[in-house]
Each structure stands twice: as C-alpha cells, then as structure tokens.
C-alpha cells in the first residue's frame, strides 16, 4: 500500500509526522518540534502548534514577528516550552536567559526578567474576545443568522461546545465573538477556548492547520463572510502583572 492509500495523516494538525507504527499498525502522529504524540480526533494544543511552527524551515513562516512593543502578541511567534500534556509552561525563557510568565494561551502577562523570575502557576485565560471586521457586502448580515453560523462553526469545525460561545455581537462591519471558559467549567476532554481561538485565527488568515480539510468556507445564508481584520483580546482569571512603566508606555 502507498502512503496515499493508507492515508496515515492527522486530520486536525498538518504540522505532524505520521506513520503506521501504533498498536496493531495503527496510524500514530507526532507533533513537529516536540515529537509529542497528538490525538488527531481533536484540536492540538496551541503550545505544541507554536513549537511545531517554530521548528519549520524559516522560509515556510509567512508571518513577521510583531514589534517588541506590541501590547498583545496575537501570533505568539516564539519557541515555547510545553508541559507533558502539551500546555504552556507558566514560565517561558529565550536562549539569552530572558524569562517571562504567560497565561494558558501563551501570551506574556508579566514584564520580562531573568532566570530568577518565578511564575507560580499557569493562569487561565477564561475570556477571549475575537474582534473581526468583514469585507463590504451588499447589505448587513442578519444578526441571528450570523450568530447561528459562528456558533455552528465553533462547534462543528473546532469541536467547541456551544456553551463556551458566550455571545456574538454585530455592528456592521464589526463582529465580536466572546468565548468564556472558567477553570471550573472546563471538563477533561473539552476543547480549550484558547486552542479553538488559535485554530480560528489561523483559518481566518488562510493558514488552516487542518490537513486536507480545506480552507475555512464561512457562509451566512449562502453569502460568503470574508474577514479583512482580526484582533484578539485575552482576559485572565488573575489580572496580569505589568510594571507602571509598561502600562503608561
């Protein structure tokens, strides 16, 4: 059998190497960069995806690192340390021993320090606000149709339970999607809102992480919804700890 016939690939993560060397010759996939085994029936964690992205050849990366002064690093382009479950380690450091604390979506939440910096726990991002601007259309989308389509998208494409899509707001051309998921609400097996938001972000940018599943085909009553700008805001269960100097910059 050829590889194409066996089709040993990871539908939910193209940044993997797969081979039929699992139990009973079953397809087993490992994330690039970390070599960790991934569950291809659900989303891969953002930490493993970022690590895989950084391990790819530099010319394969199409996005530019945000400026050092960016308040929110939406792309999070650094080579993260992930724990054995694939989550971000609370403390991240670079090769020059500069360290900082991150939240559960890997976004920096403290000033940068040295190796003595302590990050006692991984603080959960429990509220994500995805702010979109869609391209001009003949008329505004019907709000309830738009709401239903986006909830469907998060449930069917990203496997996120509808209860975690708190609200969809719309004032043409701005769409806001609120995702909420407290530590107490997230059960084992639930997709994390941070992972769903990251997959959505990459889909919107035309950089789908799905293998062979095609790009995002987002339609409201048959009318294509094309996004021209995305901003993502993260709120943590514990407020971030930046110095006043950073806050007034």
């Amino acid at each position: 059998h050829t590889a194409a016939q066996d089709n040993c690939t990871c539908p939910t993560n193209k940044m993997t190497v797969c081979s039929p060397d699992g139990p009973g010759g079953r397809c087993q996939c490992r994330a690039l960069g970390s070599g960790m085994a991934v569950d291809c029936s659900t989303l891969t964690s953002k930490c493993l995806l970022l690590k895989a992205r950084m391990s790819a050849p530099k010319n394969a990366r199409t996005l530019v690192r945000p400026s050092e002064h960016a308040l929110v690093d939406n792309d999070g382009l650094y080579d993260p340390d992930c724990d054995p479950e694939g989550r971000f380690k609370a403390r991240q450091c670079n090769q020059t021993s500069v360290c900082w604390c991150v939240n559960s979506v890997g976004v920096r939440r403290t000033d940068k320090g040295d190796l003595s910096l302590r990050c006692d726990e991984l603080v959960r991002t429990h509220h994500i606000l995805i702010d979109l601007r869609h391209r001009p259309t003949a008329g505004a989308f019907n709000h309830s149709d738009l709401d239903a389509e986006l909830r469907r998208l998060f449930r069917e494409r990203y496997r996120l339970h509808p209860k975690f899509v708190a609200a969809v707001h719309y004032e043409q051309p701005t769409i806001q999607i609120e995702l909420r998921q407290n530590t107490s609400q997230k059960a084992a097996g639930d997709v994390d809102i941070g992972d769903a938001a990251y997959y959505f972000e990459r889909d919107i940018k035309g950089e789908s992480l799905f293998q062979g599943r095609g790009g995002l085909d987002l339609r409201v009553r048959g009318e294509p919804l094309q996004v021209e700008r995305t901003l993502i805001y993260y709120l943590d269960e514990i407020p971030p700890k930046f110095s006043m100097k950073r806050l007034t910059a």
């Epitope: 539908p11 029936s41 659900t42 989303l43 469907r152 998208l153 069917e156 494409r157 496997r159 996120l160 339970h161 509808p162 209860k163 059960a187 084992a188 097996g189 639930d190 997709v191 799905f210 062979g212 599943r213 095609g214 995002l216 085909d217 987002l218 339609r219 009553r221 048959g222």
Partner: antibody, heavy 116, light 108 residues
C-alpha cells in the same frame, strides 16, 4: 481504536419503550465529540435520531424529539437511547456513532422489531 | 430541515470504470459540513469523506469528494469489486443532521 457496541432487547411491543445502550471502548466518552444514535428501517435509508455530549447536553431530531431521551453515564463510558410509544414504524437497525467531522466510528447495529 | 437529494438512484458500472455520484442540497451547505459514507449489506456505514473533500483515515485515494454550496460529488476513479455498495451523503452543518436517500452502485 474507538469501538462502539449497542445492546438491548431486539423485540419491543407496540406502545412500549425501546431502550438501547451503547458502550464505548478504546476511548473516553468525555472527549470533545458528540455521541449519536442513527436508525435505518429495513431496506431504507439512514435517519439521525439525536446526540449527546459528555456533560448531558442533547440535540434531537424534531421529528422524534417528543418521544426520545438520550442520556450518558460517564462512569460506565456509555450512552443510552429511549424511545417511548413505539409503533411498527420504529422497527429498524439502530446504530450508535461518534460525531467527529461526520460519523467516524459506528457500532455494528442492532435490529429492534416492534411487534406484539 | 436541509433535504439532500442523491442521483442517480442506481448506477450500473463495471469494475475499472469511473463512478460519479451527486448530492444536491435544498439550501446552501458550507463545504466544511458535508460527508459521504459507504454501506454494504449487513454492515454499518463507513465514513469516506468529510468536509466535502477530506478522505477519512484508511480510505483509498481512488475516492475523492468535491463541491460547494448546494452541489456535491463523490468520485470513485476506478471501481474495485469491493466498491459496489450503497453511498450516502450527509450534512452536519445544521440540526437535524440529514442524509441523502442513497445511491446504489451495482455491477453491470
């Protein structure tokens, strides 16, 4: 490898209640998937009955909603189907399936006949 | 409810031939939410294609899916003896999930 196995009586009397259970092995029911019931009358096509998430959230086919209850037992890694007030039209092969970008895993199906 | 109509109802072909099966939806379905299944007598359906074009694990590359909006196609490039079966399309983009009535691919 996820495996699903339906079990329950093969014969139910008219106006009675059809009860089936689907045991999930090789994977946890507490995953990001929904778990479905689908039926197929003899010689006919497939009809989706409804589905459940591990937290007990359900979604039913409106054509059957008034007669159907789907429940989950996480401790036993199984989910169940009850259809009340059955008639001969409910005679079918009943399948349980995992809903994960389409129904990617199915039980082998169990024939339930409604007859007195 | 989205109604899916499959045609032809029966397709009579010989092994080695190309099979083209169609599925039409009563309203627009995002291509992300369309699947195809194969069912043989006495067996459960088997997922072939999801997201209109993505082959499921273990499905041979002679099976391919395409389409968008209201028209979708399943193509079997060269029929093997084991491919003679009933094929169903299904949409999972809105509730209730619905199936087409099926296309039977039989040996000519």
């Amino acid at each position: 490898q996820v495996q699903l196995q339906e079990s329950g009586p093969g014969l139910v009397k008219p106006s009675g209640t059809l009860s089936l259970t689907c045991a999930v092995s090789g994977g946890s029911i507490s995953s990001s998937n929904w778990w479905s019931w689908v039926r197929q009358p003899p010689g006919k096509g497939l009809e989706w009955i409804g589905e459940i998430y591990h937290d007990g959230s359900t979604d039913y086919n409106p054509s059957l909603k008034s007669r159907v209850i789907i429940s989950v037992d996480k401790s036993k890694n199984q989910f169940s189907l009850k259809v009340r007030s059955v008639t001969a039209a409910d005679t079918a092969v009943y399948y349980c399936a995992r809903d994960n970008w389409g129904f990617d895993y199915w039980g082998q199906g169990t024939l339930v006949t409604v007859s007195s | 409810e989205i109604v899916l109509t499959q045609f032809p109802g029966t397709l009579s072909l010989s092994p080695g031939e190309r099979a083209t099966l169609s599925c039409r939806s009563s309203q627009s379905v995002s291509s992300s939410y369309l699947a195809w299944y194969q069912q043989k007598p006495g067996q459960a359906p088997r997922l072939l294609i999801s997201g209109a074009s993505s082959r499921a694990t273990g499905i041979p590359d002679r099976f391919s899916g395409s389409g968008s909006g209201t028209d979708f196609t399943l193509t079997i490039s060269r029929l093997e003896p084991e491919d003679f079966a009933v094929y169903y399309c299904q949409q999972y983009g809105s509730s209730p999930r619905t199936f087409g009535q099926g296309t039977k691919v039989e040996i000519k």
